[in-house]
């Protein structure tokens, strides 16, 4: 056959679907690779062909569209499973062609098993809710196109294993789940099970997402420098190691770039002719507030180094702050025989 424009295996779309549930999979060509849609392609006389390679096989096979009850079918640019089976797992290819044109892309489809508490190897989307922020909602995802608007499905929501009913601050409202006031205790996996009839059969769609309660923008503040501070003086003798931690708290702020840096005498540490190293670590609280620590280290400090200005700086989308470390040279303890004796008037 003539050369086909092969977009390869599109691993970005690692599609996971639950076993024994309907799945509708759009050919990725029209969504991500070609600049025209299926309708345009169809009216231009192009045909969409589907085939697949079973898991752990190399052989490409046509998809059997003659299964009982039309278990697998194609409608426009969508491949339908009503429902999926475990051995449907494999790489699926959609190819658009006519006598003069050919373009194809493959994508992996994994059919996943779940247990009675909806646990599975499925990668879960994360939905962030702001803590104590007023009413916030999550919506049962990826259910569009499975049934017509005339069909009224039943939707049941679960938190973990438990059906959500009579929960204090979580209220099921059809496709939505409302959180009256989100708290840390609301962290967890939430599942909606959508049940709908089709041609005398009943189908279930299971969708699980992770809710993560994060700091509220109402509570977001500019960075707070915990160290250095006015209570700690870094008193060193020449030759000793100087270690100054810069510890900064950043309240959670969606997508904020949080930065911490040191200046020495107003310059980058690299621009000063001393051997400085800076080690950084990052930790997060339960509400994704961030603490960044940068430890400035001078292995063998000189008396000149102890006269320099060491300033820790921090910035986030909320603002910028800076704090100087109190660094001084340790006054050597007096040696009794000479200094102290002189103090007593001995000669």
């Amino acid at each position: 056959s003539e050369r086909c424009d092969d977009w390869g295996l599109d691993t970005m779309r690692q599609i996971q679907v639950f076993e024994d549930e309907p799945a509708r999979i759009k050919c990725p060509l029209f969504e991500h690779f070609l600049k025209f849609n299926y309708s345009t392609a169809h009216s231009a006389g192009l045909t969409l062909i589907w085939y697949w390679t079973r898991q752990d096989r190399d052989l490409e096979e046509p998809i059997n569209f003659r299964l009982p009850e039309n278990r697998i079918s194609k409608e426009k640019d969508v491949l339908w499973f009503r429902p999926t089976l475990l051995n449907d797992t494999g790489n699926y290819t959609c190819m658009l062609r006519n006598t003069t044109y050919c373009s194809k892309v493959a994508f992996p489809l994994e059919v996943v098993q779940k247990d009675s508490c909806f646990n599975s190897p499925m990668k879960l989307p994360v939905h962030k809710l702001y803590i104590e922020y007023g009413i916030q909602r999550i919506t049962c995802p990826n259910v569009d196109g499975y049934f017509p608007s005339s069909v009224k499905p039943t939707i049941t929501w679960y938190m973990g294993c438990y059906k959500i009913q009579n929960f204090n601050n979580v209220i099921p409202e059809g496709m939505n789940l409302s959180f009256l006031i989100a708290l840390i205790s609301n962290n967890g996996n939430y599942t909606c099970v959508v049940t709908y009839p089709e041609n005398g059969r009943t189908f279930h769609l299971t969708r699980t997402l992770t809710v993560k309660v994060v700091g509220s923008p109402k509570n977001a503040v500019p960075p707070v420098i915990h160290s250095p501070n006015d209570h700690v003086v870094y008193e060193k003798e020449p030759g000793e190691e100087l270690l100054i931690p810069c510890t900064v708290y950043f309240s959670f702020l969606m997508d904020s770039r949080n930065e911490v840096w040191w200046t020495i005498d107003g310059k980058k540490p690299d621009d000063i002719t001393i051997d400085v190293t800076i080690n950084e670590s990052i930790s997060h609280s339960r509400t994704e507030d961030e603490t960044r620590t940068q430890i400035l280290s001078i292995k063998k400090v000189t008396s000149e180094d102890l006269k320099r200005s060491y300033v820790c700086h921090a910035r986030s989308a909320k603002g910028e702050v800076a704090k100087a470390a109190k660094v001084k040279q340790k006054v050597p303890a007096p040696r009794y025989t000479v200094e102290l004796a002189c103090g007593f008037g001995a000669t």
């Epitope: 997508d255 904020s256 770039r257 930065e259 911490v260 840096w261 980058k268 540490p269 690299d270 400085v276 190293t277 800076i278 080690n279 950084e280 670590s281 990052i282 700086h313 910035r315 989308a317 603002g319 910028e320």
Partner: antibody, heavy 117, light 107 residues
Framework: EVQLLESGGGLVQRGGSLRLSCAAS????????MSWVRQAPGKGLEWVSS????????NYADSVKGRFTISRDNSKNTLHLQMNSLRAEDTAVYYC??????????WGHGTTVTVSS | EIVLTQSPATLSLSPGERATLSCRAS??????LAWYQQKPGQAPRLLIY???NRATGIPARFSGSGSGTDFTLTISSLEPEDFAVYYC?????????FGQGTRLEIK
Amino acid sequence: EVQLLESGGGLVQRGGSLRLSCAASGFTFSSYAMSWVRQAPGKGLEWVSSISGSGDSTNYADSVKGRFTISRDNSKNTLHLQMNSLRAEDTAVYYCVRDYYYGMDVWGHGTTVTVSS
Amino acid sequence: EIVLTQSPATLSLSPGERATLSCRASQSVNSYLAWYQQKPGQAPRLLIYDASNRATGIPARFSGSGSGTDFTLTISSLEPEDFAVYYCQQRSYWPITFGQGTRLEIK
């Protein structure tokens, strides 16, 4: 002298992989965040990915998330970008940059990645 | 993501003239905005950081101003070597974003 030298670019088939490297010299590498920025032929600049000085924190542009991985080896003063599932739109000059808090103050000369169909 | 819109797309001026380039952000980026200059076949170079601070080695004819959403790069008297493409970049939020560029060309 502060320098960044990229390597690893080249011609690759669509769907293939490449690993870019960047050798840093003339500064305390572990003290700086580093980034990759790319520029498609005749187009503007596009940020690709960043990594903190310690390597604890990474960020990616949506266009490469799940396909590209940024990493660093502070003992060797080297930055890497592992690029998988390459697409035609990934064709660009890839710049390694030192990303100080206020701006990208040191840039490499760039390495060219061409993804063919 | 924060969208940066630069205007004009192309600016045609003569050496000695004053150039004013604009960058507008889709939401506030505080003063965390940088400007870069790129000449053909070269890597970009940092000109201005934090909206108004000149980077090391940048001539005084380059200046930046603005905060929040509206920023300006001004070149007080154009030198022949200033004709290039200029990009603004916001550093307040992930993802880091660049403007589409302003081409400064000789009239």
